[in-house]
């Protein structure tokens, strides 16, 4: 890995290695232009595998709400609008962190939690087993 | 909003309102029994739209390493392997949290940051703009 | 033990409304269709409509658009609302599991059949 | 829509016969295609996936094969359960569409 010097002007920490604890300013700072890529976009509805947007609530994480993917068709949509069935439509997932409340319902106390999202879809071909 | 009761057991905190600074323990629970569904899952190379995953590593950033992908080619791929262009393979982006080291290279204390990367691609009809 | 099992059926007459449903049990809605399928006195096969519950999509066959209403409950209930019915519905309807048949990504097919 | 055709409509067999179907696609449907057994009433049973690929519990006398546009369905050697109606099935794409059936009858 990359040893970074350390800056004299960081807060005093009790353990001097990367920390277990640390102190986190939850002033986002966005780095995108764009505050709502799913929104602007209407790629769910013109993917040949689209998908519909579930939101997914939990006071006790941060962020509270995400948006989960769910594949409309099992196959995928073809030039004349039907399913091709030889053809699957599959969910593109992401492991994403988020902040858990821990202890429960403590508002300045967190832990670091990995979380598997469903983003979009998008349209495999079929790993085809014959089965003699 | 949901209020939630606080619990008596929360570490101390000068605000008791939603904070701005608060403490994160990076002991990271994973919820996910898959730990890295995109090595495990061949869809960038079985998709339509298929996408190469290129390393994005920031030794300021935590997560230090994030996989972006970019989409292989302009159109999508058709039954005969051949690129289609009257299709296009589109990025799916999606915004995530990811702690800064701020100070710089401090390693006790951080600012959540928001940034947009891209998951994967999926296929979508083009939107034809016809010139008068 | 996956199971599919029919109700709802009965004599109506012309331009009348019948409600087929159709419990299902024993795997997960996420990986297949309930299509129904009927078949006409001394007659073949034909597919009605079908849905994909878990990602909200329904596909009925020309014969039926706007007719017929295919539906699903969070309990695994798929039901067939027909409206306007008319003498070429009657038939006999079956209610059958649609999808990879087995683990494997395998070609799809109608796997499991109500009585 | 892909249209499915079946030969024979029916065909007449003694048990012990080798008996062959055939179903042919309007188009071509690689090897989409299902095989169905079907008694009088009662619900259609699948024999047959992925044209050559046998459904659980289905005997090994029951064999498909081909791909693209021509599928064969052949019971090696007939036995008494197996007088019934076969239907093909194309699951390429929507709308799903079965062939008009095949019976076959005792001799």
């Known amino acids: 890995g990359i040893t970074i010097p350390r800056n004299p002007g960081c807060p005093n920490s009790e353990d001097k290695n990367f920390p277990r604890t640390v102190m986190v300013n939850l002033n986002i700072h966005n780095r995108n232009t764009n505050t709502n890529p799913k929104r602007s976009s209407d790629y769910y509805n013109r993917s040949t595998s689209p998908w519909n947007l579930h939101r997914n609530e939990d006071p006790e994480r941060y962020p509270s709400v995400i948006w989960e993917a769910k594949c409309r068709h099992l196959g995928c949509i073809n030039a004349d609008g039907n399913v091709d069935y030889h053809m699957n439509s599959v969910p593109i997932q992401q492991e994403i962190l988020v902040l858990r409340r821990e202890p429960p319902h403590c508002p300045n106390s967190f832990r670091l939690e990995k979380i598997l999202v469903s983003v979009g879809c998008t349209c495999v071909t079929p790993i085809v087993h014959h089965v003699a | 909003g949901i209020t939630i009761p606080r619990n008596p057991g929360c570490p101390n905190s000068e605000d008791k309102n939603f904070p701005r600074t608060v403490m994160v323990n990076l002991n990271i629970h994973n919820r996910n029994t898959n730990t890295n569904p995109k090595r495990s899952s061949d869809y960038y190379n079985r998709s339509t739209s298929p996408w190469n995953l290129h390393r994005n590593e920031d030794p300021e950033r935590y997560p230090s390493v994030i996989w972006e992908a970019k989409c292989r080619h302009l159109g999508c791929i058709n039954a005969d392997g051949n690129v289609d262009y009257h299709m296009n393979s589109v990025p799916i982006q999606q915004e995530i949290l990811v702690l800064r080291r701020e100070p710089p290279h401090c390693p006790n204390s951080f600012r959540l940051e928001k940034i947009l990367v891209s998951v994967g691609c999926t296929c979508v009809t083009p939107i034809v703009h016809h010139v008068a | 033990e996956v199971q599919l099992v029919e109700s709802g059926g009965g004599l109506v007459q012309p331009g009348g409304s019948l409600r087929l449903s159709c419990a299902a049990s024993?795997?997960?809605?996420?990986?297949?269709?309930i299509s129904w399928v009927r078949q006409a006195p001394g007659k073949g096969l034909e597919w009605v409509s079908s849905i994909y519950a878990y990602g909200g999509s329904t596909y009925y066959a020309d014969s039926v658009k706007g007719r017929f209403t295919i539906s699903a409950d969070t309990s695994k209930n798929t039901a067939l609302q027909m409206n306007s019915l008319r003498a070429e519905d009657t038939a006999v309807y079956y209610c059958a599991r649609f999808g990879m048949y087995s683990r494997w990504k395998t070609q799809p097919a109608m796997d499991v059949w109500g009585q | 829509d892909i249209q499915m055709t079946q030969s024979p409509s029916s065909l007449s067999a003694s048990v012990g016969d080798r008996v062959t179907i055939t179903c042919r696609a309007s188009?071509?449907?690689?090897?989409?295609l299902a095989w169905y057994q079907q008694k009088p009433g009662k619900a259609p049973k699948l024999l047959i996936y992925?044209?050559?690929s046998r459904a659980s519990g289905v005997p090994s006398r029951f064999s498909g094969s081909g791909s693209g546009t021509d599928f064969t369905l052949t019971i090696s050697s007939l036995q008494p359960e197996d007088f019934a109606t076969y239907y093909c099935?194309?699951?390429?794409?929507?709308?799903?569409?079965f062939g008009q059936g095949t019976k076959v009858e005792i001799k």
């Open positions: 099935q194309q699951s390429y794409s929507s709308p799903l569409t």
């Open positions: 188009q071509s449907i690689s090897s989409y």
């Open positions: 992925g044209a050559s």
């Open positions: 024993g795997f997960s809605f996420s990986s297949y269709e």
